[in-house]
């Protein structure tokens, strides 16, 4: 079982100066050093901040089930307890096909698995949506036109990693919320610098998480209840150098929907996320579809 002992403070004085400098410095990539100030964790300060068992970050990448780390707050032990010996990744024979046919309006049962991204919900048109709270915001170092050209592949791969369904959030006009990302500029810059045309260096992508099939699967205790927990999971994968996603991410975060939702009581560290998750799971299940809508 994970020890519940205090993490050491950052052992290297040099790491203080390296925090948040956009370089992942291996020697500073630890919880005590804040994952190099977020440089190694996609700017997520501490992906495991809600996890009471303090050693779960060490066990996250060991491909063994550590029950004390299998809670949502501990990022499901990287799904090590959930896999149950089954294949953890989409069958390579299907993967390209599933990416090409993701959310194309036709149900492909071979792709309708969590590890293949649930076929973009093509097999779940009659099942009501069950959205996780908030919006998952990714900054991708790819201009919007390029990212949108490969949108099906992008969403399929991300859905497969998170083992649930991802889709672009749509604006009032039904357009995908994918915006140009310009470098953030300090306010006190000289006039000459302000006059430079802003360089588009990526895209800000707003995503919704739809747990309708995740919550229907036999082991339905591993769905992300909110966008921030999904962002924490992606940050954790990045921190342990196991994020197999071919789109370069600058950062990830969860944002509440506008207008701000009322805060949930008991949302502190540790058990807070569990409480929120349990409450939402009851809500999801009560509003869930009748059994005959399941697609297997």
């Amino acid at each position: 079982a994970p020890e519940v002992s205090e993490e050491p403070r950052c052992p290297r004085a040099a790491c203080q100066a390296k925090r948040g400098d956009q370089r992942c410095d291996r020697e500073c990539n630890s919880p005590g050093c804040g994952w190099d100030g977020g440089d190694c964790s996609l700017s997520v300060g501490d992906p495991w901040r809600q996890c009471e068992a303090l050693q779960c970050w060490r066990l996250f990448n060991n491909s063994r089930c550590d029950p004390a780390c299998s809670s949502p707050a501990c990022l499901y032990d990287n799904f090590d307890c959930h896999a149950g010996g089954r294949e953890r990744t989409c069958n390579p024979v299907y993967e390209k096909y599933c990416a090409d046919h993701f959310a194309d309006g036709r149900c492909d049962q071979g792709c309708n698995t969590e590890e293949c991204g649930w076929d973009g919900l093509d097999c779940a048109s009659e099942v009501p949506a069950l959205l996780a709270r908030g919006v998952l915001v990714l900054t991708v170092l790819l201009p919007p036109e390029e990212l949108l050209r490969s949108s099906a592949d992008f969403l399929q791969r991300l859905s497969a990693i998170l083992r649930t369904s991802l889709r672009f959030r749509l604006d009032a006009h039904g357009q995908a919320m994918v915006f140009p990302y310009h470098r953030p500029s300090p306010g006190s810059e000289p006039r000459a610098r302000r006059e430079l045309a802003p360089e588009v260096i990526g895209s800000v992508v707003m995503l919704e998480i739809d747990n309708r099939l995740c919550l229907q699967s036999p082991e339905n205790d591993h769905c992300f209840p909110d966008a921030q927990s999904a962002a924490d999971y992606l940050g954790a994968l990045s921190a342990v150098e196991r994020l197999d996603f071919p789109y370069p991410l600058r950062d990830v975060r969860g944002e509440p929907l506008e207008p701000p939702e009322p805060s949930v009581p008991g949302g502190g560290s540790g058990g807070g996320l569990n409480d929120i998750f349990e409450a939402q799971k009851i809500e999801w299940h009560e509003g869930g579809p009748p059994h005959h809508h399941h697609h297997h």
């Epitope: 956009q22 370089r23 410095d25 170092l141 990526g202 150098e241 197999d244 071919p246 370069p248």
Partner: antibody
Framework: EVQLVESGGGLVQPGGSLRLSCAAS????????MTWVRQAPGKGLEWVAE????????NFNEKFKGRFTISVDNAKNSLYLQMNSLRAEDTAVYYC????????????WGQGTLVTVSS | DIQMTQSPSSLSASVGDRVTITCKAS??????IAWYQQKPGKAPKLLIY???NRYTGVPSRFSGSGYGTDFTLTISSLQPEDFATYYC?????????FGGGTKVEIK
């Protein structure tokens, strides 16, 4: 338009010193890490060192630590490489390049400046 | 430090050929690989970043693939202007090592 222009190369005797410069224009200089890469005649590319104009942080190829120093002058949008105790094997074309955010691929390079170390 | 090993070091091919160059990292580097093309007397040019993303303006005949330790640069149909030397480079963590290069020559 992003432009990087190196200067300062030339002939120097073994044991001597040389300071290379790279003038950057067309973008916000402090926003990007800057790098030196070198290439000996007929050989491959070799990463030397990088610096963040914003934080002053540096990373070096261990091979060059102690002999080479990387620095910037943000007021001049310029990058420098101070090379001391030069050896014949330091003969190479030295390129400056702009490292892209977080991952450090090099989309923009200078034209290179040739350093020849010979007696 | 992680080493990047390219193969072959040189190859001869004809216009229209499909050419594959490999780069092997001594440890897992995820997707953190870039590919460059260099012609004699010129600075390198970025072709592919983050293993599989084509840089702006790079022709679609160039593609990159791989994850972890094994990476491939493929030129689907070699053009006269593609005869050059190609390098892989490790991204994300210092040191940002380059592979030894692959020279593509005319057969």
């Amino acid at each position: 338009e992003v432009q990087l222009v190196e200067s300062g190369g030339g002939l120097v005797q073994p044991g001597g010193s040389l300071r290379l410069s790279c003038a950057a224009s067309g973008y916000a200089f402090t926003d990007y890490w800057m790098t030196w890469v070198r290439q000996a005649p007929g050989k491959g590319l070799e990463w030397v060192a990088e610096i963040s104009p914003n934080s002053g942080g540096t990373n070096f190829n261990e091979k060059f630590k102690g002999r080479f120093t990387i620095s910037v002058d943000n007021a001049k949008n310029s990058l420098y490489l101070q090379m001391n105790s030069l050896r014949a094997e330091d003969t190479a074309v030295y390129y400056c390049a702009r490292g892209e955010i977080r991952y450090n691929w090099f989309a923009y390079w200078g034209q290179g400046t040739l350093v020849t170390v010979s007696s | 430090d992680i080493q990047m090993t390219q193969s072959p070091s040189s190859l001869s091919a004809s216009v229209g050929d499909r050419v594959t160059i490999t780069c092997k990292a001594s440890q897992n580097v995820g997707n953190n690989i870039a590919w460059y093309q260099q012609k004699p007397g010129k600075a390198p040019k970025l072709l592919i970043y983050y293993a599989s993303n084509r840089y702006t303006g790079v022709p679609s005949r160039f593609s990159g693939s791989g994850y972890g330790t094994d990476f491939t640069l493929t030129i689907s149909s070699l053009q006269p202007e593609d005869f050059a030397t190609y390098y892989c480079q490790r991204l994300y963590n210092s040191p940002f090592t380059f592979g030894g290069g692959t020279k593509v020559e005319i057969k």
